[in-house]
């Protein structure tokens, strides 16, 4: 992202690059289902995707007031193996329920320091943050 | 996110809230597999999660120079139904391969305007952007 303007003075860009939060309200990013109760190792025939999956999962909240997004959700698998498509409850040892990970871009609020080293408000620091998105039914790896 | 400081002057916060891009280099956020070739409706016994899944998918790039993150990846299912755990190739009509969607927080670059309406560099506008994360093998909905 080196060609994105910084809000610090830099060559070739306006001297004051203010990156302002839009005042447009953004609804919270909640997964379709946050019903952490009555979750078990079974594939439902209705409800949201994470409960109908044969590799069902639940979501756990990760809240950090100094981060954007403040709320992230981590998937947690409810079964070690995949659930049978036929019954929706018995596990099939031929399939593993594995977490799918993603390195998400997040921004942490950090104190900014002016030219003289004094505190000049807050800056954003971009980081990668690993989140688990879902559980996926996969064929186990065959070691060569 | 109303309690996050704005970089515009506001009560209770320092008058100049500069949100600066960190100079820490961030590696590109590429999924483990971007091999768009030799993708087919089968579950492999090796390779990345998206090719071993019984609801396999490929990734498609979404690049926008005016957005952070600039590169996002959308999952695209390779099969309408789930692949049999036994064979890894034949489809099982008892299971559907469905896309899992997520509204991701992204930031668009917009011209900032100073007090007199003149262009004062760039601001960030926070938006929700729908991305498909993965394909999940689910039991079809049973209509009540």
């Amino acid at each position: 992202y080196s060609h994105w303007p910084s809000c610090c003075p830099s060559k070739g860009y306006p001297s004051e690059e203010l990156l302002r939060w839009s005042t447009v309200p953004v609804p919270p990013l909640k997964p379709a289902s946050l019903d952490f109760h009555s979750v078990s190792c079974r594939a439902s025939e209705d409800g949201p995707l994470n409960s109908r999956a044969i590799s069902p999962w639940r979501y756990e909240l990760d809240r950090d007031l100094n981060r954007l997004p403040q709320d992230l959700y981590h998937a947690r698998c409810l079964c070690p193996h995949c659930v049978s498509l036929q019954t929706g409850s018995h596990m099939d040892p031929r399939g593993n329920s594995e977490l799918l990970y993603h390195n998400q871009t997040v921004f942490y609020r950090r104190p900014c320091h002016g030219k003289k080293g004094n505190h000049k408000g807050y800056c954003l620091e971009r980081r990668l943050y690993r989140v688990s998105l879902a559980c996926v039914c996969v064929r186990p790896r065959v070691m060569g | 996110y109303s309690h996050w400081p704005s970089c515009c002057p506001s009560k209770g916060y320092p008058s100049e809230e500069l949100l600066r891009w960190s100079t820490v280099p961030v590696p590109p956020l590429k999924p483990a597999s971007l091999d768009f070739h030799s993708v087919s409706c089968r579950a492999s016994e090796d390779g990345p999660l998206n090719s071993r899944a019984i609801s396999p998918w490929r990734y498609e790039l979404d690049r926008d120079l005016n957005r952070l993150p600039q590169d996002l990846y959308h999952a695209r299912c390779l099969c309408p139904h789930c692949v049999s755990l036994q064979t890894g190739s034949h489809m099982d009509p008892r299971g559907n391969s469905e896309l899992l969607y997520h509204n991701q927080t992204v930031f668009y670059r917009r011209p900032c305007h100073g007090k007199k309406g003149n262009h004062k560099g760039y601001c960030l506008e926070r938006r929700l952007y729908r991305v498909s994360l993965a394909c999940v093998c689910v039991r079809p909905r049973v209509m009540g």
């Epitope: 080196s2 060609h3 | 498609e60 120079l65 005016n66 957005r67």
Partner: antibody
């Protein structure tokens, strides 16, 4: 100073493959955010985007023409290539290469254009 | 696929007159770009990211708009502004750059 210049066969027969070269200077296609695209314009008509290639070798194509197009680059010699398979009279046009990026998705620099004619 | 419709197709203006042309998108777009093309020449970028003036473009040109409605304005028409103007947008996914059909501006 940024310059781009297109070159091609000028004339070719129906069903042949059109090969175009864009030679550029004043920027590097290894710079993050940089891209080079191809746009064509039939005589007296509007502009149509064909394809572009990014600094990291990501290629993107117009879906309507994707099956016939191949874009590639040689960063060291500052060239981008476009091949169009199975040409016919609908492909008669002036072909432009243009730079994209690194900051936005406009085309800030264009080549002078190369006229391509298809005739049996 | 987003379609850009420019209006009017042809227009004319006196020197010194204010000129405004429109570009309507079939669905909402984030940014609009404007190019100027004179006969026998390559297109030239005038406006990027809806309202920013490209390098070397006279300040009499300006762009505005949002959503599906965008416009290019020339505050005072000059003889050298006689040309065809194209609006352009891009969609990041699936990737697609589209141009409007053009507005031909003539000098009276």
């Amino acid at each position: 100073q940024v310059t781009l210049k297109e070159s091609g066969p000028g004339i070719l027969q129906p069903s042949q493959t059109l090969s175009l070269t864009c030679s550029f200077s004043g920027f590097s296609l290894s710079t993050s955010g940089m891209g080079v695209g191809w746009i064509r314009q039939p005589s007296g008509k509007g502009l149509e985007w064909l394809a572009h290639i990014w600094w990291d070798d990501v290629k993107q194509y117009n879906p309507a023409l994707q099956s016939r197009l191949t874009i590639s680059k040689d960063t060291s010699s500052s060239q981008v290539f476009l091949k169009i398979a199975s040409v016919d009279i609908a492909d008669i046009a002036t072909y432009y290469c243009a730079r994209i990026g690194p900051v936005h998705h406009g085309f800030p620099y264009w080549g002078q254009g190369a006229l391509v004619t298809v005739s049996s | 696929q987003i379609v850009l419709t420019q209006s009017p197709a042809i227009m004319s203006a006196f020197p010194g007159e204010k000129v405004t042309m429109s570009c309507s998108a079939s669905s909402s777009v984030n940014y609009m770009y404007w190019h100027q093309q004179k006969p026998g020449s390559s297109p030239r970028l005038l406006i990027y990211d809806t309202s920013n003036l490209a390098s070397g473009v006279p300040v009499r040109f300006s762009g505005s708009g949002s959503g599906t409605s965008y416009s290019l304005t020339i505050s005072r028409m000059e003889a050298e502004d006689a040309a065809t103007y194209y609006c352009q947008q891009w969609t990041s996914y699936p990737p697609m750059y589209t141009f409007g059909g053009g507005t031909k501006l003539e000098i009276k």
